[in-house]
């Protein structure tokens, strides 16, 4: 029960996180005009990873895409790459985790396969979350650097009469969305990895032993206990008192030279 809950919760948290990473990547407000010196401005600037926008007091908003690759700062390109890698890994992770969910039955998929898929998706979510957090943090660092640089030469005067005010930018909403979303994806990934440990069947050091009595065949399999989730029946832990009859699970176990005493 706990494993299924952990896995399900990990999936949902990761799903929310990846949706957040996608939203943050698409948002225009990665950096917004710093209003410290002028809290009420008639022209407000903000920038995203893909375009920069200007919102006027009139309500008119004009956005212009960055229609160049070579002309953009390397750091911006790096942030774009990190966010896209995060989204791609997250999307693949979600796809894998859907099939790995314990509550979803797909053919006769082994629990060990589900455990492996859960671990894979968990690792993907962790890397996805780290990519998003790294991307947002790199952008934030870039903003902080530029902020203090522009503060240093905020006003370039012309004879002290004419002032050219340099626009300073501060953290936009997308940064906070990205940090939170990356964190959620990371947490979801960790939860998936924890769930994977509970899903994996424990290996035993000895094989099943069959005892044959006259007239009746009693097959007893010691060990083989899985970490029980409380869902369904544990068919590998059954005594069969039905002369040679086998359960579906036991059809997979073929006798070896050590099976009969």
């Amino acid at each position: 029960m706990a494993v299924t809950a952990c896995q399900g919760l990990g999936f949902v948290v990761s799903l929310i996180g990846i949706a957040g990473i996608i939203a943050a990547t698409c948002m225009d407000q990665w950096s917004t005009q710093d209003l410290y010196n002028n809290p009420v401005t008639a022209v407000f600037n903000y920038q995203g990873l893909w375009r920069s926008c200007v919102r006027e007091s009139s309500g008119f908003t004009e956005c212009r895409g960055y229609f160049t690759l070579l002309g953009l700062p390397a750091m911006l390109q790096a942030v774009r790459a990190l966010m896209i890698v995060g989204i791609v890994l997250g999307a693949i992770g979600l796809l894998v985790s859907i099939f790995a969910l314990k509550c979803i039955r797909i053919g006769s998929m082994e629990d060990s396969a589900k455990a492996n898929m859960t671990l894979t998706s968990g690792i993907m979510f962790i890397v996805s979350g780290l990519c998003a957090i790294a991307g947002v943090s790199v952008f934030a660092n870039m903003l902080v650097t530029n902020f203090w640089m522009s503060t240093a030469n905020m006003y370039t005067g012309m004879g002290g009469m004419v002032q050219t005010v340099q626009t300073r930018y501060t953290f936009g909403a997308a940064l906070f969305v990205g940090w939170v979303a990356g964190g959620l994806t990371l947490i979801g990934g960790v939860m998936m990895c924890i769930a994977c440990r509970g899903l994996a069947p424990e290996e035993t050091n000895y094989k099943a032993v069959s005892y044959h009595a006259s007239g009746h065949s009693v097959a007893y399999k010691p060990g083989g206990f899985k970490a029980s989730t409380g869902f369904g029946s544990n068919t590998k832990n059954k005594k069969i008192y039905d002369g040679g009859a086998r359960t579906e699970d036991e059809v997979q176990s073929y006798p070896s030279k050590h099976d009969y005493v």
């Epitope: 005009q33 002028n38 009420v40 401005t41 008639a42 022209v43 600037n45 903000y46 920038q47 920069s52 926008c53 200007v54 006027e56 007091s57 009139s58 309500g59 008119f60 004009e62 212009r64 004419v162 002032q163 050219t164 005010v165 340099q166 626009t167």
Partner: antibody
């Protein structure tokens, strides 16, 4: 077509208040900001403030803050400017104008003359 | 507040001649975000409200004759009337549309010589 129609001329005594209205038609009232501008006879233009009819947000010139109050009634597409504690230097023509892209005022009404005299 | 200074305060030009009005702002009106200059030009005839001519320093309002043109960037701007017509006799104002409070120049009275 877009039209801004203001109320008629007003004569007030010093210390009194005046409320000038500006009725908009021919466009969606809540989609555009309304600005108010003062012009004394034979003189230049002076910005009083603006109101965003959708949310009621207002911005005032420091000179008029505290004395001018801008409001808007969305139901009748009308903007108002109330000027309190009138003095003789408030005698002027008051215009309302619609703000558009470039923060430019594209449509103006004919103006309301306010005379403050004892 | 941004101070707008127009020159000359009055100007007499013959019909068909070119008229040039200058406007200087105490602070740059160039917005780095969209590389637009937030300067607006208005024309006001006696007994009438101002009429929008040019916004963003050089974009002509629809319906405004193409003899009117705006130029300049940062702090120095110019309104040019390429060939003065009788109906162009008016007072012209430049306005800072970049920062609150919006401020106007003192006006330039354009007369016919």
């Amino acid at each position: 077509q877009v039209q801004l129609v203001q109320s008629g001329a007003e004569v007030k005594k010093p210390g009194a208040s005046v409320k000038v209205s500006c009725k908009a038609s021919g466009y969606t009232f809540t989609s555009y900001v309304i600005n108010w501008v003062k012009q004394k006879t034979g003189q230049g233009l002076e910005w009083i403030g603006e109101i965003h009819p959708r949310g009621g947000n207002t911005y005032y010139s420091e000179k008029f803050r505290g004395r001018a109050t801008l409001t808007a009634d969305k139901s009748i597409s009308t903007a108002y400017m109330e000027l309190s504690s009138l003095r003789s230097e408030d005698t002027a023509v008051y215009f309302c104008a619609r703000l558009r892209r470039g923060n430019a005022m594209d449509y103006w009404d004919q103006g309301t003359t306010v005379t403050v005299s004892s | 507040d941004i101070v707008m200074t127009q020159s000359p305060s009055s100007l007499a030009v013959s019909l068909g001649e070119m008229a040039t009005i200058n406007c200087k702002s105490s602070q740059s009106l160039l917005n780095s975000g969209n590389q637009r200059n937030y300067l607006t030009w208005y024309q006001q005839k006696p007994g009438q409200p101002p009429k929008l001519l040019i916004y963003w320093a050089s974009t002509r309002e629809s319906g405004v004759p193409d003899r009117f043109s705006g130029s300049g960037s940062g702090t120095d701007f110019t309104l040019t009337i390429s060939s003065l017509q009788a109906e162009d006799v008016a007072v012209y104002y430049c306005q800072n549309s970049y920062n609150y409070p919006y401020t106007f120049g003192q006006g330039t009275k354009l007369e016919r010589k």
